[in-house]
Interface confidence: low
């Protein structure tokens, strides 16, 4: 004869004055047996949708509908997906800091602009928070033995660079 709630399984509740394990009622759960009450299942509605249904032994898990992402532990809030030029942090969407960009919608992190000079190239178009810099063609580099002669051409002020 059961005279204790200690042996009750998850998915049940039990009252000390009547120590019988009883199934949790509809839309409630208990992950630990023998508790006096079952917990009300989380409802995923509005900006939330079900990731995992509620059962007698575990709560429902929600995720955000398309175009939104979760914030907080166990996805307590939904926030609109980040725009290009932003990245998702624990505090929500944050604008990329100077010198970084993110060209993706809803995902991705801010990445540093390309360093054109590492490839020996000049900056053709400066970067923004949404777009990387555009590098120009490689800058011509001259060796010590190269002779440069500047010759007048086509009138005053006109010069052409000739590499011999």
């Amino acid at each position: 004869v059961q005279n204790s709630c200690d042996n009750c399984q998850p998915g049940t509740f039990c009252r000390k004055y009547n120590p019988v394990c009883k199934s949790c009622p509809p839309s409630t759960f208990s992950s630990i047996g023998g508790q006096p009450n079952c917990n009300i299942c989380r409802v995923c509605a509005g900006y939330f949708r079900f990731k995992k249904f509620c059962s007698s032994t575990h709560n429902a898990e929600c995720e955000c509908i398309e175009g939104f992402h979760c914030l907080g532990p166990q996805c307590t809030r939904c926030e609109k997906d980040c725009r290009p030029g932003q990245e998702l942090t624990k505090q929500g969407c944050k604008t990329c800091s100077l010198g970084t960009f993110n060209d993706q919608n809803g995902t991705g992190v801010c990445r540093p602009w390309t360093n054109c000079s590492l490839d020996g190239r000049s900056v053709l178009k400066t970067g923004t928070t949404e777009k990387d810099v555009v590098c120009g063609p490689p800058v011509v580099s001259f060796s010590p033995s190269t002779t440069i002669s500047v010759t007048p051409e086509g009138g005053p002020g006109g010069h052409s660079l000739q590499v011999l």
């Epitope: 299942c41 509005g46 995992k52 249904f53 059962s55 007698s56 575990h58």
Partner: antibody
């Protein structure tokens, strides 16, 4: 007692749409989700999606996005499913079912609606 | 989606015989499994939820068991009214998915 009364059989032409209904009685409509399930001989039972009868929000199985549209009229305790751009593969029996004893199970089912798509 | 593999596809049993139907999930479903009975030309009826819990009004000759990925439905003492199709269904992950069904006939 809980009852889900569905509309009558539908014969539809390819490319057309049908809208079938499910009238709930014997319980508080907004306390449960209403789910829709497709049954064919070849594919068996396939879950289409549910409508949250309280908020009117719906959620679809990826396979049926764009095919089914779920709505609810709380004043008449009736849920609807519209099937669009019908093709012969949409020929099936469609059931509405109440979100079950625990969400995710289906404790009461309508009698089903036979939809036949044929030219 | 979680795949539910049901076996056998069909089964003949004599009255009074005990029969078992198996359901195998493609991943662990933590007992989030239901069984349904569907008689010819009718809609499915809810029999068992949470793998082993009988829905109110379901005869005690029906029982469910299992864990992890493997589950079974047992009918202890086949009755004429048990002739039907039986389906398992997982609700561990969205979308819910069903087994392909077992046709149970009287021998």
């Amino acid at each position: 007692q809980v009852q889900l009364q569905q509309s009558g059989a539908e014969l539809a032409k390819p490319g057309s749409s049908v809208k079938i209904s499910c009238k709930a009685s014997g319980y508080t409509l907004t306390s449960y989700y209403l789910n829709w399930i497709k049954q064919t001989t070849g594919q068996g039972l396939e879950y289409i999606g549910y409508i949250d009868t309280g908020s009117g929000g719906s959620h679809y199985n990826e396979k049926f996005k764009g095919k089914a549209t779920l709505t609810v009229d709380k004043s008449s305790s009736t849920a609807f499913m519209q099937l669009s751009s019908l093709t012969p593969v949409d020929s099936a029996v469609y059931y509405c079912a109440r979100g079950g004893y625990y969400d995710g199970f289906f404790d009461y089912w309508g009698q089903g609606v036979m939809v036949t798509v044929s030219s | 989606d979680i795949q539910m593999t049901q076996s056998p596809a069909s089964l003949s049993a004599s009255l009074g015989e005990t029969v078992s139907i198996e359901c195998l999930a493609s991943e662990g479903i933590s007992n989030d499994l239901a069984w349904y009975q569907q008689k010819s030309g009718k809609s499915p009826q809810f029999l068992i939820y949470a793998a082993s819990r009988l829905q109110d009004g379901v005869p005690s000759r029906f029982s469910g068991s299992g864990s992890g990925t493997r589950y079974s439905l047992k009918i202890s003492g086949m009755q004429p009214e048990d002739e039907a199709d039986y389906f398992c269904q997982q609700s561990y992950k969205y979308p819910p998915t069903f087994g392909s069904g077992t046709k149970l006939e009287i021998k």
